[in-house]
C-alpha cells in the first residue's frame, strides 16, 4: 500500500498511489482538487 495524506496530517492507505502536500510551483505532480495540498506524485 502507498500513502494518501492531506496537508493537515490525515492519512489513509489507499491503492497503489502516493499523495502528499507539494508546492505546485515545483512542478512535481498533478493537483487532485478539493483537498489541502493534495498532489499526485507517483
Amino acid at each position: 500500500d502507498a500513502e494518501f495524506r492531506h496537508d493537515s496530517g490525515y492519512e489513509v492507505h489507499h491503492q497503489k498511489l502516493v499523495f502528499f502536500a507539494e508546492d505546485v510551483g515545483s512542478n512535481k505532480g498533478a493537483i487532485i482538487g478539493l483537498m489541502v495540498g493534495g498532489v499526485v506524485i507517483a
Partner: antibody
Framework: QVQLVQSGAEVKKPGASVKVSCKAS????????IHWVRQAPGQGLEWMGF????????NYNQKFKGRVTMTRDTSTSTVYMELSSLRSEDTAVYYC??????????????WGQGTLVTVSS | DIVMTQSPDSLAVSLGERATINCRAS??????????LNWYQQKPGQPPKLLIY???KQGTGVPDRFSGSGSGTDFTLTISSLQAEDVAVYYC?????????FGGGTKVEIK
C-alpha cells in the same frame, strides 16, 4: 480559458466497452488531475475516479471492480475513460472535471459538456 | 465508504424567500478544523457547478445569497433570497476520503 471538450454520444450493446475522451486546453495539462463523474438519467452524481496526467497514475471507485480504466495522452492533452462489460445500468451522462485544491486562494471547477452513453440491446 | 444523505428531496420556495437544504454524512468529513464538504448546483442539461467548498467558502463568482454552514457530519446550504435562476438540483459532496461521494440531490423550485 480552461476548456474540457468531450467526445460525442455513444450507443453500445450490453457486454461491450466504451471509451470516452476529454480534451483539455487553456492550462498546463499535467498540472491537474482529471476526474470522471457520471449521472444516470434523472439520477444523482457518482464519482468514478481520477487520473493524473503528470504520472498516469489513476485512482478508481472500487464500485466499478476493474471495469474502468483511465488513461491519458500528453501529446494531445487528452484523458480517456474506458468502461467495459457494459450493462443497462451504465446508461448515463459521463462528465470529466478538474478542480482546484482548497489552499490555492481561489477554488474553481471546470467540467466537460458531458457524453451520453446508452447501453441497449 | 462515506454515505451522504440530503433532505428534503425537493423544496418549493417563493421568490425572495429563504431556502435551506440539509446534508448529513455517515461519518465525520472534518480533519484538522477543515470540513471536506462541497455543494454543487446543477441546472437541466448542464454539468454541475461548484457553489461552496470546505463547507463555508464560496466558489469563484458565486452570488453572496448562497452560504454554507456546519461541521462534522451535519451541513446546511442556504439561499437567503431565492431568485428565478436558482431553480436547480443541489448536491453535497465529501472530498475527505476516496471514493468521493455525493448526496442524492435536492430539487429547488419556485412556489
Amino acid at each position: 480559458q480552461v476548456q474540457l471538450v468531450q467526445s460525442g454520444a455513444e450507443v453500445k450493446k450490453p457486454g461491450a466497452s466504451v471509451k470516452v475522451s476529454c480534451k483539455a486546453s487553456g492550462y498546463t495539462f499535467t498540472t491537474y488531475a482529471i476526474h470522471w463523474v457520471r449521472q444516470a438519467p434523472g439520477q444523482g452524481l457518482e464519482w468514478m475516479g481520477f487520473t493524473s496526467p503528470y504520472s498516469g497514475v489513476s485512482n478508481y471507485n472500487q464500485k466499478f471492480k476493474g471495469r474502468v480504466t483511465m488513461t491519458r495522452d500528453t501529446s494531445t492533452s487528452t484523458v480517456y475513460m474506458e468502461l467495459s462489460s457494459l450493462r443497462s445500468e451504465d446508461t448515463a451522462v459521463y462528465y470529466c472535471a478538474r478542480f482546484d485544491n482548497y489552499d490555492r486562494g481561489y477554488v474553481r471547477d471546470y467540467w466537460g459538456q458531458g457524453t451520453l452513453v446508452t447501453v441497449s440491446s | 465508504d462515506i454515505v451522504m444523505t440530503q433532505s428534503p428531496d425537493s423544496l418549493a420556495v417563493s421568490l425572495g424567500e429563504r431556502a435551506t437544504i440539509n446534508c448529513r454524512a455517515s461519518e465525520s468529513v472534518d480533519n484538522d478544523r477543515i470540513s471536506f464538504l462541497n455543494w454543487y448546483q446543477q441546472k437541466p442539461g448542464q454539468p454541475p457547478k461548484l457553489l461552496i467548498y470546505a463547507a463555508t467558502k464560496q466558489g469563484t463568482g458565486v452570488p453572496d445569497r448562497f452560504s454554507g454552514s456546519g461541521s462534522g457530519t451535519d451541513f446546511t446550504l442556504t439561499i437567503s433570497s431565492l431568485q428565478a435562476e436558482d431553480v436547480a438540483v443541489y448536491y453535497c459532496q465529501q472530498s475527505k476520503v476516496f471514493p468521493w461521494s455525493f448526496g442524492g440531490g435536492t430539487k429547488v423550485e419556485i412556489k
